[in-house]
């Protein structure tokens, strides 16, 4: 079974979570207008 998200027991969902998408600057220029 795959790893779960969206629960406090998961380390990826801990309070250290920035909540931010990657938003890489080198990719933004490729986005469709």
């Amino acid at each position: 079974s795959e790893t779960t998200t969206g629960t406090s027991s998961n380390s990826s969902q801990s309070t250290s979570n920035s909540g931010l998408a990657p938003n890489p600057t080198n990719a933004t220029t490729k986005a469709a207008g």
Partner: antibody, heavy 117, light 113 residues
Framework: QVTLKESGPALVKPTQTLTLTCTVT?????????VSWIRQPPGKALEWIGY???????RYNPSLKTRLTISRDTSKNQFVLTMTNMDPVDTATYYC??????????WGQGTTVTVSS | DIVMTQSPLSLPVTPGEPASISCRSS????????????LTWYLQKPGQSPQLLIS???TRASGVPDRFSGSGSGTDFTLKISRVEAEDVGVYYC?????????FGGGTKLEIK
Amino acid sequence: QVTLKESGPALVKPTQTLTLTCTVTGYSITSGYTVSWIRQPPGKALEWIGYIQYTGSTRYNPSLKTRLTISRDTSKNQFVLTMTNMDPVDTATYYCARGTTASFDYWGQGTTVTVSS
Amino acid sequence: DIVMTQSPLSLPVTPGEPASISCRSSQSLLYSSDQKNYLTWYLQKPGQSPQLLISWASTRASGVPDRFSGSGSGTDFTLKISRVEAEDVGVYYCQQYFIYPLTFGGGTKLEIK
């Protein structure tokens, strides 16, 4: 248990300013995550409005940026969305949702806002 | 902005049968730094708020039945339901959680035949 709940006026007039509040329970809004505002016009898809991070920093959708302010009240564990110059096309259900680094994992129930004279 | 395109628009399915929803993005959602695809799936049941199903293209959220699975990479993604149940009705949305502004697909309405 994490919960988010939106509140605000159901009806606003064109050109008026909309103020919505998102009250969070189950975690401290200064401890992590972002909270985004997302809207959904009747029968249509979802549109991301903007977020406020646990640090207080904000980011807005460029299509709405000039009309938006997202702020917070840490003492009340609340976020506030202010949208100026409302128009009938802004009629929608407005949601607040907690953002992780990969998704919106908790959503509010939504509040329906109608813009009409 | 990244454009998210879903198909089909409507999906009538017989209970117990499989279902598949496609989502395409106008640019790659694969982040080179961590090799993850920042593609998320949500289900909005009638009269309810959206709920998280799958993040990082294939990681099921807590409590989501294993009949739901996500796959794909880059710009082409798929949500599959192995055996549709009556409770699965609603509108399915894909979303890119990669570059701001975050954007959603137009939705796929799953209905029971």
